[in-house]
C-alpha cells in the first residue's frame, strides 16, 4: 500500500536513510519508508512539491521558503532540551560596561557564529533589515552588513567580495592559520567563538544563542580564554532599545528560533508521518538500539536526517509554516530572504503629470549614474486610482500616495506600504493630529462620549480635521447614525447647532449654519471662505473662543497658533492655551500639549505603495541609498529627490516637505501605516457612500 519517500541531500544521509528504512521494515513499522536522493535541501523541496518525494527535515529558514514558495507544511517537530522545548533563542550580547543598544549598532564591531548561520547571521541581519535599521539595496545583504558594522568576524565570509570588512576581526588559530574559516580553525567560529570575540574585546556585540554566555562564563570547565569571565559582566540587547541580564533571554531576545521540522505537501496526512516516526523513535532513539535515529556518528557526519541533539519528535498541531516559525522569526526571515536573481531589474514608478514625468526621468538617470538598483522606469497613469489599478495589474510597481489614497490602495487593490515620508516638526500642514478642543470648564465639563446636544464648530464641510475625521469617528463609534446615508441630517440632529461653512448650500440643514456669523457686516454667513469669520481652523477655534460653540474640531496646532500672543487679532490677543483642553477618545480630557496622545486621528504622512509580492526592503533600500546622495535639497549630485522647483511643479514623486524617506517598520499594512483611528474615521465616512 502506502509509502513515505524521504528525501536525502547527500551520500551519508542517503546511507543513514537506507539504514533507517531497513530498521523500520524489520520492526514492521508502516507505512514503508523509501529514500529519494536530492542534491540539496532546496532540490528536495522541489521534489516534494512535484510529488517525487514526500518528506524532509528542514531548518527554520528552509521551512519559511518551502512554506511560502511551495506550500509545504511542517508536521513533526524536533525537541532538544526540555527547558526550551521546540525552540531556542537568538540573542545579541554586549559587555555591561558598553553603551551599545539595538538602536546604536551602526558602526559597532560585530561577532557572528558564521555566515548564513541561524542565530549568528540570519536572525540578526534579518531582524535589522525588517525593523528598518539596516537598509539593503539590490539584495546585496553582504554589502549592507559590511557597510553597517564597523568591522566584523563572520566566519565563512572570506570567499565573499566584502571579506575585508566581514573578516576584519577574525584571528584564525594560535598560529594565525584559518583566518575567517567556517570551522574551528577560526578561534571566533561558532557560538563560543563569537562570544569569545566579544569577551576578548575584538567586537562590541556578539550574536549567539540564549545559553552561550552561561555556558562560557562563571568558572565552568572552560578553556583558558573563558575561565575568568563572569556572566554578570554581559548583558542582552532587547528589541525595544533596553538591555537586560543574560538570564532574561525569554523576554529579551531578537527572535525565538523554531526547531527543525519535517515538512510535507499540504495534501499529505501529517498524522500519518508522525505515527511512522513516533514508532521509529520509540524503538530507535535509545542507547543500545540497533539503529540510532538521532545520531550521525556512524556516518562520519553531523545532523543527518535529524539534528543529533534531538531528544524526541513531537506532532505539530497547527500545521502552517507561519505558526511553527512564530512571528519574530518569520519577520526576520522576511528581512533576510532576498534573491538577487529574482530581483526585477526595474522599479516602475507611476507618474501623473508632465512635470512628474520630467522629474522621474531625471531621477532614473541620476540613480543609474550612481549604479543604484533596481533601476527606475517611469510609467504614466491618469490618476492615483489608475496607478493603483496598474500596480495591481503588474504594469507598474510603485507610487507615493496620500492618506485617503493609501486607504483605497490597501482596501480595494491590496497594496502595501514599502516606505514612508517623514517631515520636519515645523511642517504640520503635511502630517497632523485632528483634535477636539473645548474650554477648560470644571463646572460643565463633558467628554467625547457626551457630545450629543452640544454646539460644534467645524473648519468647513469636507475639511479633513474639521469634518471628515470627526464626523467619521463619531459615526464609527456609533454616536451618529445616519439614516439612508444622509450624513448631513444626522450630524445636524446630533449637535444642537453648528457652524460648518460650505460652498454649495443647496439642501443644507440650517442647523449646520446656525452658529456661523458671516463677515463684519453680517453678510456671507456660512460661506466656505474667509468671509465667514468662523471658517477654517482658525475660525472654528474662534467660534469656540467667542462661546458660540462648545467644541471645535481643528488641527493640533490651531490652539497654539491663536493663543499666548501668537495671533494679534483682537479676538485672540489675550487668549492663553492653558484655558483650553482636548477631548480624548478614551473619555478623558488632556492638556492641549498632549495632542500626540489625545486625538481623534493623525493625518498620516504619504507612503510609497507597492504590490504585496514586492520586496519592500529592496524598495526602501533603494530610496535610502538614493536619499544619502539626493535627499538634501542643497546636494551637489545633480538631482533633488524632495524638491520640485526645477520642474515648475510641487510635490512631484514625493512631497517637497519630505525630510527623509523612512522604513515602514511594523506598519506593513495600509491599516498599520494609517493608524486605526484614521482608518476608523475613513470607514465611518465611507460606510455612508451610497
Amino acid at each position: 500500500g502506502m509509502e513515505v519517500r524521504w528525501c536525502a541531500t547527500s551520500d551519508p544521509e542517503q546511507h543513514k536513510c537506507g539504514n533507517m528504512s531497513e530498521a523500520f521494515r524489520e520492526a514492521g513499522i508502516q507505512p514503508s519508508l523509501l529514500c529519494v536522493r536530492g542534491t540539496s535541501a532546496d532540490h528536495c523541496v522541489q521534489l516534494i512539491a512535484a510529488q517525487e518525494a514526500d518528506a524532509i527535515t528542514l531548518d527554520g529558514g528552509a521551512i519559511y521558503e518551502a512554506g511560502k514558495e511551495h506550500g509545504l507544511k511542517p508536521v513533526v517537530g524536533e525537541v532538544y532540551d526540555q527547558e526550551v522545548g521546540t525552540s531556542y533563542y537568538a540573542v545579541a550580547v554586549v559587555r555591561r560596561s558598553s553603551h551599545v543598544t539595538i538602536d546604536t549598532l551602526k558602526g559597532v564591531k560585530s561577532c557572528h557564529t558564521g555566515i548564513n548561520r541561524t542565530v549568528g547571521w540570519n536572525v540578526p541581519v534579518g531582524y535589522l533589515v525588517e525593523s528598518g535599521r539596516l537598509s539593503v539595496m539590490g539584495c546585496d545583504v553582504l554589502k549592507a552588513v559590511s557597510d553597517y558594522f564597523g568591522g566584523s568576524c563572520v566566519p565563512g565570509a572570506g570567499e565573499t567580495s566584502y571579506s575585508e570588512s566581514l573578516c576584519r576581526l577574525c584571528r584564525g588559530d594560535s598560529s594565525g592559520e584559518g583566518v575567517c574559516d567556517k570551522s574551528p580553525l577560526e578561534r571566533y567560529y561558532d557560538y563560543s567563538g563569537a562570544f569569545r570575540c566579544l569577551a576578548e574585546g575584538a567586537g562590541d556585540v556578539a550574536f549567539v544563542k540564549h545559553s552561550t554566555v552561561l555556558e562560557n562564563t562563571d568558572g565552568k570547565t572552560l578553556p583558558s580564554w573563558g575561565q575568568a569571565l563572569l556572566s554578570q559582566d554581559f548583558e542582552l540587547l532587547c528589541r525595544d532599545g533596553s538591555r537586560a541580564d543574560v538570564t532574561e533571554w525569554r523576554q529579551c531576545h531578537l527572535a525565538r528560533v523554531p526547531a527543525h521540522a519535517v515538512v510535507v505537501r499540504a495534501d499529505t496526512d501529517g498524522g500519518l508521518i508522525f505515527r511512522l516516526l513516533n514508532e521509529g523513535q520509540r524503538l530507535f532513539s535509545h542507547e543500545g538500539s540497533s539503529f540510532q535515529m538521532f545520531s550521525s556518528e556512524a556516518y562520519g557526519q553531523k545532523d543527518l536526517l535529524f539534528k543529533d541533539s534531538t531528544s524526541e519528535l513531537v506532532p505539530i498541531a497547527t500545521q502552517t509554516y507561519e505558526a511553527w516559525l512564530g512571528h519574530e522569526y518569520l519577520h526576520a526571515m522576511k528581512g533576510l530572504l532576498c534573491d538577487p536573481n529574482r530581483l526585477p531589474p526595474y522599479l516602475r514608478w507611476c507618474v501623473l503629470s508632465t512635470p512628474e514625468i520630467q522629474k522621474c526621468g531625471d531621477m532614473a538617470v541620476a540613480f543609474r549614474r550612481q549604479r543604484l538598483k533596481p533601476e527606475i522606469q517611469c510609467v504614466s497613469a491618469k490618476s492615483p486610482q489608475h496607478c493603483m489599478e496598474r500596480i495591481q495589474a503588474e504594469q507598474v510597481d510603485a507610487v507615493t500616495l496620500s492618506g485617503e489614497d493609501i486607504y483605497t490602495a490597501g482596501k480595494t487593490y491590496g497594496l502595501v506600504p514599502a516606505a514612508g515620508e517623514h517631515y520636519a516638526p515645523e511642517d504640520s500642514s503635511n502630517s497632523y493630529y485632528v483634535v477636539a478642543v473645548v474650554r477648560r470648564d470644571s463646572s460643565h465639563a463633558f467628554t467625547l462620549d457626551e457630545l450629543r446636544g452640544k454646539r460644534s464648530c467645524h473648519a468647513g464641510f469636507g475639511s479633513p480635521a474639521g469634518w471628515d475625521v470627526p464626523v467619521g469617528a463619531l459615526i464609527q463609534r456609533g454616536f451618529i447614525r445616519p439614516k439612508d446615508c444622509d450624513v448631513l441630517t444626522a450630524v445636524s440632529e446630533f449637535f444642537n447647532a453648528s457652524c460648518v461653512p460650505v460652498n454649495n448650500p443647496k439642501n443644507y440643514p440650517s442647523s449646520l449654519c446656525a452658529l456661523c456669523v458671516g463677515d463684519e457686516q453680517g453678510r456671507n454667513k456660512c460661506v466656505g471662505n474667509s468671509q465667514e469669520r468662523y471658517y477654517g481652523y482658525r475660525g472654528a477655534f474662534r467660534c469656540l473662543v467667542e462661546n458660540a460653540g462648545d467644541v471645535a474640531f481643528v488641527r493640533h496646532t490651531t490652539v497654539f497658533d491663536n493663543t499666548n500672543g501668537h495671533n494679534s487679532e483682537p479676538w485672540a490677543a489675550e487668549l492663553r492655551s492653558e484655558d483650553y483642553e482636548l477631548l480624548c477618545p478614551n473619555g478623558a480630557r488632556a492638556e492641549v500639549s498632549q495632542f500626540a496622545a489625545c486625538n481623534l486621528a493623525q493625518i498620516p504622512p504619504h507612503a510609497v505603495m507597492v504590490r504585496p509580492d514586492t520586496n519592500i526592503f529592496t524598495v526602501y533600500g533603494l530610496l535610502d541609498k538614493a536619499q544619502d546622495l539626493f535627499g538634501d535639497d542643497h546636494n551637489k549630485n545633480g538631482f533633488k529627490m524632495f524638491d520640485s522647483s526645477n520642474y515648475h511643479g510641487q510635490d512631484l514623486l514625493f512631497k517637497d516637505a519630505t525630510v527623509r524617506a523612512v522604513p515602514v517598520g511594523e506598519k506593513t499594512t495600509y491599516r498599520g501605516w494609517l493608524g486605526l483611528d484614521y482608518v476608523a474615521a475613513l470607514e465611518g465616512m465611507s460606510s455612508q457612500q451610497c
Partner: antibody, heavy 119, light 112 residues
C-alpha cells in the same frame, strides 16, 4: 521644570566614536523633538540632529554618515554617537528640546559637555 | 542650507542704552503653513544658549520685556530697549523653516 543633562567621556581619541547621553527630567521624550547641537571652542552653534517622539531620526547632512541618535524611553534618555572623530569634532555638545509650544525653537538646553578629541 | 548672516558681529553698548542686532536669511523664512520659524538665543559667558524669542516676535516665558523681535521674510531684528549688565554675551538668530536648522554666526554684546 524641564531639565536636560549631558553625560559622557570628555576625551576621545581620533578615529574612535564619541558617545554622549542626555538624561531628561520634567518631560517625557515620547513627546516633542530631542536634539543635539555642538559648539567648537570660541565658535558658533552647529545643529547635529534630532530624534522625534515616534523615534524617527533626522541628521544634518554634513554629519549624517557619522551620526547615530537613539533613545531609551524606559530611562527617559537619548544618546548621540559620532564615529571616526577628528580634532575638528572637539566642541561643547548640547542636548535641547523642541516642542510645538514654542514653534519648535529650542526652549530648554542642557548645560553642555566639552568633548576633546586628542590622542 | 539656509545661511543666516548677523550684523554687527560685535556690539559695544552703554548700560541703559538700546541695542539692535540684525539677522538676514539667504531665503525667505515663511513656511508653507504661514509661520516664520525664526528664533533668537542668548548665550552668556560660560553658559549654554537660552531661548529669548521664537516665531520672530514671541518672547519665551521669563524673558524680560526689554527684549523684542521683529521682521519678516528674510530680514529680522532683535532689540534690547535698555541694556543691563546681565545682557552681556553672544546673541544668535536661528531658522528652522528649512532643515537643517541653522544659526547666525553670533553677535557679541559687550558693555562700553
Amino acid at each position: 521644570q524641564v531639565q536636560l543633562q549631558e553625560s559622557g567621556p570628555g576625551l576621545v581619541k581620533p578615529s574612535e566614536t564619541l558617545s554622549l547621553t542626555c538624561t531628561v527630567s520634567g518631560d517625557s521624550i515620547t513627546s516633542g523633538y530631542w536634539n543635539w547641537i555642538r559648539q567648537p571652542p570660541g565658535k558658533g552653534l552647529e545643529y547635529i540632529g534630532y530624534i522625534s517622539d515616534s523615534g524617527i531620526t533626522y541628521y544634518n547632512p554634513s554629519l549624517k554618515s557619522r551620526v547615530t541618535i537613539s533613545r531609551d524611553t524606559s530611562k527617559n534618555q537619548y544618546s548621540l554617537k559620532l564615529s571616526s572623530v577628528t580634532a575638528a569634532d572637539t566642541a561643547v555638545y548640547y542636548c535641547a528640546r523642541r516642542t510645538l509650544a514654542t514653534y519648535y525653537a529650542m526652549d530648554y538646553w542642557g548645560q553642555g559637555t566639552l568633548v576633546t578629541v586628542s590622542s | 542650507d539656509f545661511v543666516m548672516t548677523q550684523s554687527p558681529l560685535s556690539l559695544p553698548v552703554t548700560l541703559g542704552q538700546p541695542a539692535s542686532i540684525s539677522c538676514r536669511a539667504s531665503q525667505s523664512l515663511v513656511a508653507s503653513d504661514g509661520n516664520t520659524y525664526l528664533a533668537w538665543y542668548q548665550q552668556r559667558p560660560g553658559q549654554s544658549p537660552r531661548l529669548l524669542i521664537y516665531r520672530v516676535s514671541n518672547r519665551f516665558s521669563g524673558v524680560p520685556d526689554r527684549f523684542s523681535g521683529s521682521g519678516s521674510g528674510t530680514d529680522f531684528t532683535l532689540k534690547i530697549s535698555r541694556v543691563e549688565a546681565e545682557d552681556v554675551g553672544v546673541y544668535y538668530c536661528s531658522q528652522s523653516t528649512a532643515v537643517p536648522p541653522t544659526f547666525g554666526q553670533g553677535t557679541k554684546l559687550e558693555i562700553k
